[in-house]
Interface confidence: low
């Protein structure tokens, strides 16, 4: 799953590691626009 931040939120893309605080990282788990987020994020939640 690639990073999904809105155009308003492009510069937090360096916060990469998913948290253990959520069960899964679904597409609805982050805001929608992927075009301004260069860093892909892991889909794994331990």
């Amino acid at each position: 799953v690639s990073s999904a931040l809105t155009p308003h939120l492009p510069t937090h893309a360096d916060s990469q590691t998913p948290s253990t605080g959520t069960d899964t990282q679904t597409p609805s788990g982050s805001a929608a626009n992927t075009t301004l987020s260069p860093t892909p994020r892991s889909n794994d939640i331990s």
Partner: antibody, heavy 119, light 108 residues
Framework: AVQLLESGGGLIQPGGSLRLSCAAS????????MSWVRQAPGKGLEWVSA????????FYADSVRGRFTISRDNSKNTLYLQMNSLRVEDTAVYYC????????????WGQGTLVTVSS | EIVLTQSPGTLSLSPGERATLSCRAS???????LAWYQQKPGQAPRLLIY???SRATGIPDRFSGSGSGTDFTLTISRLEPEDFAVYHC?????????FGGGTKVEIK
């Protein structure tokens, strides 16, 4: 276990300055964006500011922009909020919160530190 | 700025009853970017739901979230004594991140 411990709150006069700190442990601090969220007595939550994992990018609510500065020291696993030109309406409990993968929602919160701005 | 309005302000119910809390946004929230938190007196908020309907780790399945666009709902299917608290919704579709005013669920 993830722990976030805020400090630095207290009583301050209007126009004064205060620096809040949040000591983080139990996770790779530099990998996560962090935020400050505040709650005035008896009121709802208000997002104040956010900072990216590297510290290179910051966001602010309009109500504090130009007066507050968020920063972090990843070598010390500590988040800061420098508050200048404090106003009575800044009185609140200030929470440090760990973000999930970006400036989105918060999976861990500290217990908060009370800032009271009064003459 | 997206304004979130929660209703009712206070919900008076008995243990075992169903609680339905509403969060309405002033404009559509992209990708259902909405979270719900529980807060008890003197404590920090606790994440319950993200992405409008996904439960956070350790959250009992009596808590469920639904909705999209501008209307979102948190449902507690059967209230337990520990569920009486204030519930906040938060949108993260755009900055500034905003919260609703909260709904207090109190014992009737």
């Amino acid at each position: 276990a993830v722990q976030l411990l805020e400090s630095g709150g207290g009583l301050i006069q209007p126009g004064g300055s205060l620096r809040l700190s949040c000591a983080a442990s139990g996770f790779t601090f530099s990998s996560y964006a962090m935020s400050w969220v505040r709650q005035a007595p008896g009121k709802g939550l208000e997002w104040v500011s956010a900072i990216s994992g590297s510290g290179g990018s910051t966001f602010y609510a309009d109500s504090v922009r130009g007066r507050f500065t968020i920063s972090r020291d990843n070598s010390k696993n500590t988040l800061y909020l420098q508050m200048n030109s404090l106003r009575v309406e800044d009185t609140a409990v200030y929470y440090c919160a760990k973000e999930v993968m970006g400036p989105i929602f918060f999976d861990y919160w500290g217990q908060g530190t009370l800032v009271t701005v009064s003459s | 700025e997206i304004v979130l309005t929660q209703s009712p302000g206070t919900l008076s119910l008995s243990p075992g009853e169903r609680a339905t809390l509403s969060c309405r946004a002033s404009q559509s929230i992209i990708s259902s970017a909405l979270a719900w938190y529980q807060q008890k007196p003197g404590q920090a908020p606790r994440l319950l739901i993200y992405g409008a309907s996904s439960r956070a780790t350790g959250i009992p399945d009596r808590f469920s979230g639904s909705g999209s666009g501008t209307d979102f709902t948190l449902t507690i299917s059967r209230l337990e004594p520990e569920d009486f608290a204030v519930y906040h919704c938060q949108q993260y579709g755009s900055t500034p991140l905003t919260f609703g005013g909260g709904t207090k669920v109190e014992i009737k």
